[in-house]
C-alpha cells in the first residue's frame, strides 16, 4: 500500500484531512448549540486512487472489482478512521447542558 | 432521520448492501489463494442524500456542508458499518493454511 | 490578541458584597464564553461558573449558586461577577478565563486578589 | 462531581530529566482532560487539550497521554523555565474540576 503522503494524482488531491470552517448557521445548530460559536470542521476529503491508505481487505477488493467493473463498483471513499472529541454547550428546556461527542471531528482519514 | 429503506431517489437506489460475484482472478487473488475459486462479496453501494442512514454527527454535519458548498465537501459515502468473517483456503510453502478475515465482507452500510 | 484585564485588588469586609470586572479586548467579545475560577493560597482551582456574552446565559458550580452572579456588559465587553455575603472562605485569587471551545481555558485574565477581613 | 486525583504532589528534578505528571479521574472522563501550567503569581497556561492535543505556541517537549481515568503529561527534557504547578481539568461535566496540582520544582 503506498504511504498515505504520495499521491499519485498531484500533492493534496487524495484522501487527507481538511479543514472547513462553519458557523452554527450553517451547521443548522444555531437553535440548540450556544457554545462554541464557530467550529473549525476536520473532515476526510480526496480521492482514493488504487490502494491509497486502504483501510483493510475490504478496501482492496473494492479497488480490484473497481478497476473492472467501474460502473457498477464505485472506487473506495475517503473517510474517518478515527475522531477528536468535542464538547458543545447546548440549550435545554431548564437552561444548559454540556454535552460530549466523540463522533464529531475527523482525526485522521482513511479509504474505504 | 430517514429510515434507512424510504431512499428518496427511488428504490434501491440509496446507500444499501449488495452482492458482486468475483472470481479469484478478478481479484487478484489466483496466486495465493486456493478456495472458494469464486466470492460473493457484499460491499455498500448507493446514494447517501440528506441524513439518509447518518452513521454518526460527523456524517450529519458534512451533509450540511456538502449542501452549503458542494464543491469543496463531498456528500457522506456508502461504506461498510460491520463486516462478516470469511475463510480462506491458502497456499503456503509448505502447503496449505486456512486463514478467516474478519475486514472482507460487508454485512451492513452506512452513510459517513 | 486576546487580553482578559480583570479590576484591581479588593480589601473588604466580612457579611459585605463585591463585584469584580474582566474587560475583554482584541476580539469580539461575543466570539468568547468566560468562565470564572477561583484559587486560594497555595491551592488549586475551582471552576465557579460560566456565561454566554451574546444573552447572557450562565452556568454556575452548585457549590457557588448564591454565592456568585455572573453578568455580562456587551456594550463596554466586559464581565463581572459579584460575590455575596463574604466570608474568610472566599478570600482568594479569582480569574476570567476566555473560552472558544468550551471545553477548557485558553485565555486567562491576570486575576483579582479578594481579602476579606474585619 | 468527578475528582481528580494528581500525582505526585511534588516532582523534584534536575534540568534535561524527562518527567511524567499522572492525573487520575475518580470515572471515566474519555478524552475529556485538559492540562495547565501556572508559575509563582501568573496565570494559568493552557498546555494540552483533550489528553494529547498540542496548543499552539507550546513547546513540543510537552505531550499528553491517556483516556479513560488515567492521564499523564510528560516533558521530555525538563527545562528551567518549566518549574511551578501543573494542574489538570475535565470538561467531561459540570462541574468543571481540576486536579490539586502538581509542583515541579529543581531539585
Known amino acids: 500500500a503506498r504511504n498515505g503522503d504520495d499521491c499519485p494524482l498531484g500533492p493534496g488531491r487524495c484522501c487527507r484531512l481538511h479543514t472547513v470552517r462553519a458557523s452554527l448557521e450553517d451547521l443548522g445548530w444555531a437553535d440548540w448549540v450556544l457554545s462554541p460559536r464557530e467550529v473549525q470542521v476536520t473532515m476526510c476529503i480526496g480521492a482514493c486512487p488504487s490502494q491509497f491508505r486502504a483501510a483493510n481487505m475490504h478496501a482492496q477488493i473494492k479497488t480490484s472489482l473497481h478497476r473492472l467493473k467501474p460502473d457498477t463498483v464505485p472506487a473506495p471513499c475517503c473517510v474517518p478512521a478515527s475522531y477528536n472529541p468535542m464538547v458543545l454547550i447546548q440549550k435545554t428546556d431548564t437552561g444548559v447542558s454540556l454535552q460530549t461527542y466523540d463522533d464529531l471531528l475527523a482525526k485522521d482519514c482513511h479509504c474505504i | 432521520a430517514r429510515n434507512g429503506d424510504d431512499c428518496p431517489l427511488g428504490p434501491g437506489r440509496c446507500c444499501r448492501l449488495h452482492t458482486v460475484r468475483a472470481s479469484l482472478e478478478d481479484l487478484g487473488w489466483a496466486d495465493w489463494v486456493l478456495s472458494p475459486r469464486e466470492v460473493q462479496v457484499t460491499m455498500c453501494i448507493g446514494a447517501c442524500p440528506s441524513q439518509f442512514r447518518a452513521a454518526n454527527m460527523h456524517a450529519q454535519i458534512k451533509t450540511s456542508l456538502h449542501r452549503l458548498k458542494p464543491d469543496t465537501v463531498p456528500a457522506p459515502c456508502c461504506v461498510p458499518a460491520s463486516y462478516n468473517p470469511m475463510v480462506l483456503i491458502q497456499k503456503t510453502d509448505t502447503g496449505v493454511s486456512l486463514q478467516t478475515y474478519d475486514d472482507l465482507l460487508a454485512k451492513d452500510c452506512h452513510c459517513i | 490578541q486576546v487580553q482578559l484585564q480583570q479590576s484591581g485588588p479588593e480589601l473588604v469586609k466580612p457579611g459585605a458584597s463585591v463585584k469584580l470586572s474582566c474587560k475583554a479586548s482584541g476580539y469580539t467579545f461575543t466570539s468568547y464564553d468566560i468562565n470564572w475560577v477561583k484559587q486560594r493560597p497555595g491551592q488549586g482551582l475551582e471552576w465557579i461558573g460560566w456565561?454566554?456574552?451574546?444573552?447572557?446565559?450562565?452556568k454556575y458550580n452548585e457549590k457557588f449558586k448564591g454565592k456568585a452572579t455572573l453578568t455580562v456588559d456587551t456594550s463596554s465587553s466586559t464581565a463581572y461577577m459579584e460575590l455575596h455575603s463574604l466570608t474568610s472562605e472566599d478570600s482568594a485569587v479569582y480569574f476570567c478565563a476566555g473560552t472558544y471551545d468550551p471545553a477548557y481555558f485558553d485565555y486567562w485574565g491576570q486575576g483579582t486578589t479578594l481579602t476579606v477581613s474585619s | 462531581d468527578i475528582v481528580l486525583t494528581q500525582s505526585p504532589a511534588t516532582l523534584s528534578v534536575t534540568p534535561g530529566d524527562r518527567v511524567s505528571l499522572s492525573c487520575r479521574a475518580s470515572q471515566s472522563i474519555s478524552y475529556y482532560l485538559h492540562w495547565y501550567q501556572q508559575k509563582s503569581h501568573e496565570s494559568p497556561r493552557l498546555l494540552i487539550k483533550y489528553a494529547s492535543q498540542s496548543i499552539s505556541g507550546i513547546p513540543s517537549r510537552f505531550s499528553g497521554s491517556g483516556s479513560g481515568t488515567d492521564f499523564t503529561l510528560s516533558i521530555n527534557s525538563v527545562e528551567t523555565e518549566d518549574f511551578g504547578m501543573y494542574f489538570c481539568q475535565q470538561s467531561n461535566s459540570w462541574p468543571y474540576t481540576f486536579g490539586g496540582g502538581t509542583k515541579l520544582e529543581i531539585k
Open positions: 456565561i454566554y456574552p451574546r444573552d447572557g446565559i450562565s
